[in-house]
């Protein structure tokens, strides 16, 4: 036998107008039992019973999995990074074989004047992390690398990197017209052919808090949006307190459903209450307490 | 690790003559670059001589035709001929090796280095 359920009811009013019973199970709803021992779990909405209580997915929650969360947690990650992938010839070294080693001699020391020299040009890149050499080849010696580029996460950061790619573009070129071989010498740490820096292509972080608060909303994606407080995204519903798209019920109880938000209105001792934002108020008539 | 040891310094008279030499430990002689600078008081260290195993060299412009690089690769050594020198010359002179074949003048982009000789030219 299904065990019984206690059933709290309050009286609400739709804001269509009509009274309702809005119970803390929808028994209404066609639901399957199962049954752990002498627990019995009505665990809806893809939730399944642990032996002590639903575990609800996102987005919701309650005792039978049965409602709907007001806000859903969404991470975006502490730092966002960017890479480039460039091509520069340096004509102050002299190709030989053991460069195409990664663990050579010469590759170790010629990675290090790279960086040293990339660290400088670079220098006053906020974003700049880093260089990483993939590939070295003959021509004098043409160095495919990657630019590393980070910041912290901001609403911003696609702009604050784009803008960074740029000043790299700028400076790679700045150096490698500047810092050319005369008479076969080189003055400067390293030397370069003005005609072979290329920017190969570039990577961006792609991170988008509206796509992970719909992903996560499942069938309520058209409800959940996202708001950003102190830079930070969160993914809520109208029914969330303290937003710019925070629903006022006034006199009533936020609920979602899958067709958006929507006040259901109170019933006090002296008033009822409807409207769609349960804002009208109807004076119940009076009665004479004899106490 | 390529290991460099200097000697050969000394004081001097204007004109006079001597040679430096740097021994090399490793088996990276044969190829790369190697070099000498030279550092005064007060001053950014400067290249002197320099050498590649491809056939480059370069002289400063202040010691051409008075200084002579060369090595003896049998020796694993770098020797530095100096002829008719000069009280500008007086300087800490460094040997430096690469085994990247350079074509550069920094010493940054050097990255062995010996302790230095003295060089005094005085009369």
């Known amino acids: 036998p299904l065990a019984t359920i206690p059933v709290s009811t309050t009286s609400l009013t739709s804001s269509e107008g009509s009274t309702i019973s809005t119970p803390s199970v929808d028994i209404s709803t066609p639901v399957t039992t199962s049954i752990v021992g002498d627990q019995c779990s009505r665990c809806k909405n893809g939730g399944f019973w642990d032996g002590l209580k639903c575990q609800c997915l996102t987005p919701y929650y309650g005792e039978s999995c049965e409602e709907v969360v007001n806000s859903i947690d969404i991470a975006p990650p502490e730092t966002v990074s960017a890479q480039m992938e460039l091509t520069v010839t340096v004509t102050s070294v002299k190709f030989t074989d053991e460069l195409k080693n990664h663990s050579s001699q010469e590759f170790r020391e010629f990675n290090k004047t790279f960086t040293e020299q990339m660290n400088i040009v670079y220098s006053g890149i906020p974003e700049y992390v880093g260089v990483n050499i993939t590939n070295l080849r003959l021509g004098s010696v043409v160095v495919e690398h990657d630019v590393l580029l980070r910041t912290k996460y901001t609403p911003e950061y696609k702009t604050a990197l784009d803008n960074a790619t740029e000043v790299v573009k700028q400076k790679i070129t700045k150096v490698t017209t500047e810092q050319i071989m005369t008479n076969d010498n080189c003055s400067a740490l390293m030397c370069f052919n003005t005609t072979g820096t290329q920017v190969q292509n570039i990577t961006v972080t792609q991170y988008d808090p509206v796509e992970e608060c719909r992903q996560k909303a499942e069938e309520y994606e058209d409800y959940f949006l996202v708001e950003y407080r102190d830079q930070k995204p969160y993914c809520i519903s109208p029914c969330e307190s303290g937003f710019n798209a925070s629903k006022n019920c006034n006199h009533g109880k936020c609920q979602m459903s899958q067709n958006g938000a929507r006040c259901l209105c109170v019933t006090t001792e002296t008033h009822w209450y409807s409207g769609e934002d349960c804002n009208q108020g109807t004076q119940k008539s009076h009665h004479h307490h004899h106490h | 690790e390529v290991q460099l040891v200097e000697s050969g310094g000394g004081v001097v008279q204007p004109g006079g003559s001597l040679r430096l030499s740097c021994a090399a430990s490793g088996d990276t002689f044969s190829r790369g670059s190697w070099g000498w600078f030279r550092q005064a008081p007060g001053k950014e260290r400067e290249a002197v001589a320099l050498i590649s195993s491809d056939g480059w060299t370069f002289y400063a412009d202040s010691v051409k035709g008075r200084f002579t690089i060369s090595q003896d690769n049998s020796k694993n050594t770098l020797y530095l001929q100096m002829n008719s020198l000069r009280a500008e010359d007086t300087a800490m002179y460094y040997c430096?090796?690469?085994?990247?074949?350079?074509?550069?003048?920094?010493?940054?982009?050097?990255?062995?280095w010996g302790q230095g000789t003295q060089v005094t030219v005085s009369s």
């Open positions: 430096a090796a690469s085994v990247l074949v350079l074509r550069t003048l920094n010493p940054k982009a050097w990255h062995h």
